[in-house]
Interface confidence: low
Amino acid sequence: QPVESFPLDFTAVEGNMDSFMAQVKSLAQSLYPCSAQQLNEDLRLHLLLNTSVTCNDGSPAGYYLKESRGSRRWLLFLEGGWYCFNRENCDSRYDTMRRLMSSRDWPRTRTGTGILSSQPEENPYWWNANMVFIPYCSSDVWSGASSKSEKNEYAFMGALIIQEVVRELLGRGLSGAKVLLLAGSSAGGTGVLLNVDRVAEQLEKLGYPAIQVRGLADSGWFLDNKQYRHTDCVDTITCAPTEAIRRGIRYWNGVVPERCRRQFQEGEEWNCFFGYKVYPTLRCPVFVVQWLFDEAQLTVDNVHLTGQPVQEGLRLYIQNLGRELRHTLKDVPASFAPACLSHEIIIRSHWTDVQVKGTSLPRALHCWDRSLHDSHKASKTPLKGCPVHLVDSCPWPHCNPSCPTVRDQFTGQEMNVAQFLMHMGFDMQTVAQPQGLEPSELLGMLSNGS
């Protein structure tokens, strides 16, 4: 018996969106027990029909899809997972993380979590959308355009994989989309910045100019800053990001957005992998999500937080990193940057928990949608009570009480914020002073989670 579907396209809703959302959520929750038996949370694997668009090892690339026939929203998520930039570290990656280089062992289904969940409780933002998860198997930050050959041991086709997935999805209902949101985490987040304009251009050329293409870049806004301790470019993790990308682009035959490429000389295209340099050149609206103290950024900067208390030099370096990142986001109107030590957020099940200035990420994304919808009516002012620029201003890691739990990397134990800050070498007097508080008051506030 085919299930009747009720198209709910929120982009068409005028007036009190919050009240409407509350009613829909209530309706969904009341209907949920009846339909729980039929609900299938899984996204199903489709390997690309065009088998010349491949993963590193020549196996066909693909995507996982869960259709939502009543919706004209499509969410395409780019997976992350570092990269490799020479024969040796790609060989090593192939031997230790093969699913990031080959489709041969991919499971037939995946569960959608976080922003990919179809449960309104877990995904109050876009639970009704068509969900697409594109596994990362090109190791090139979604930028490559070279196939496997006698000369090339591996294919690097990240940019081409995205184009081919979009092409195939047009035959599966994407052609009727109103909004395509290209999202991604970590290397996938950087992949969004590198590919969002190209996807918009592709759809225009194929005759779908009405599809609004937007980007959501999570944990992919990196800085080409000075490492805490400089190390030679030996492996993926210790190599300075500028050097790794410089080498990678040549190895992958990497492509960057045209408008950004024109801003830099030949051989300097690596600059376009860094959010604060590529963002001003993008035409599509992009929402940037970035922890101010991103663990992957710290890793490439050679900061490894062990069980030992942090030395003052390192503490200042970490604080300065947060300051620099905050500065790069000042002209990014749609951004969500909590002062936490973490990495990735949007496909975590508890992605709704973190707040900046009292606003959660799904709420901020909803406000962003509204602002884009309203901007067609030439209104450029931020919506009252619906903020989209949310960057923490407090200056140390986990000064935001809604940050995800920190674990002591040495013992694996959960730490409360006061413990964590002392562990980081922060003197409570120093932390309390700028807030105009006594250390005892601050400790009280932190342990109460306020």
Partner: antibody
Framework: EVQLVESGGGLVKPGGSLKLSCAAS????????MHWFRQAPEKGLEWVAY????????YYADTVKGRFTISRDNAKNTLSLQMTSLRSEDTAMYYC????????????WGTGTTVTVSS | DIVLTQSPASLAVSLGQRATISCRAS??????????MHWYQQKPGQPPKLLIY???NLESGVPARFSGSGSGTDFTLNIHPVEEEDAATYYC?????????FGSGTKLEIK
């Protein structure tokens, strides 16, 4: 059944040579990186050498570098360890092991072959 | 090279009780959400047998009384309830980088 079987061990004089083999069966050998380990009598496990699935990358422990050579023949499903300039401290049980490709742990081990270096 | 310090060197546990073995790495062996630490069991005259991979995942066919935990540099293998057949030497191993190294082993005796 997934299996690794070592052979070629024996008694050899210091300075001598020996070639160990490891025959793989029950799985697609060419898909896996392979390692050699050794264990001296009443001692712990020591890594000796590694070869990637397609022989593109090889690594050796400092203690054997320049004396031992790891190789593989994917057509014949065999892994080899050529040992030269043998020393008494090379005396051990030698194991070949399959490295699982998603995490670098060793999920299949051979039964071992004994190498004794003594005059 | 990463040094793995295993403790205790030997352990005697009564049948049905809990055995806890620790392994501390000289450097963090966790990255990008994975902890590259694994546990093996070895009985006399036999090769090592994989028990736990990536810190906490039970290898197929291994009884559920074996469990692993930890992240960063500190890892633990628990066996509960201990059975007669668990008498063996247990090794931790990291795969965070080459060379992969092993702990010095913990010999478990059943009382």
């Amino acid at each position: 059944e997934v299996q690794l079987v070592e052979s070629g061990g024996g008694l050899v004089k210091p300075g001598g040579s020996l070639k160990l083999s490891c025959a793989a069966s029950g799985f697609t050998f060419s898909d896996y990186g392979m390692h050699w380990f050794r264990q001296a009598p009443e001692k712990g496990l020591e890594w000796v050498a590694y070869i990637s699935s397609g022989s593109r990358t090889v690594y050796y422990a400092d203690t054997v570098k320049g004396r031992f050579t790891i190789s593989r023949d994917n057509a014949k499903n065999t892994l080899s360890l050529q040992m030269t300039s043998l020393r008494s401290e090379d005396t051990a049980m030698y194991y070949c092991a399959r490295k699982h490709y998603n995490g670098g742990y060793f999920d299949v081990w051979g039964t071992g072959t004994t190498v004794t270096v003594s005059s | 090279d990463i040094v793995l310090t295993q403790s205790p060197a030997s352990l005697a546990v009564s049948l049905g009780q809990r055995a806890t073995i620790s392994c501390r790495a000289s450097k963090i062996v966790s990255t990008s959400g994975y902890s590259y630490m694994h546990w093996y069991q070895q009985k006399p005259g036999q090769p090592p047998k994989l028990l736990i991979y990536l810190a906490s995942n039970l290898e197929s066919g291994v009884p559920a009384r074996f469990s692993g935990s930890g992240s960063g540099t500190d890892f633990t293998l628990n066996i509960h309830p201990v059975e007669e057949e668990d008498a063996a030497t247990y090794y931790c191993q990291h795969s965070r980088e080459l060379p992969p190294t092993f702990g010095s082993g913990t010999k478990l005796e059943i009382k």
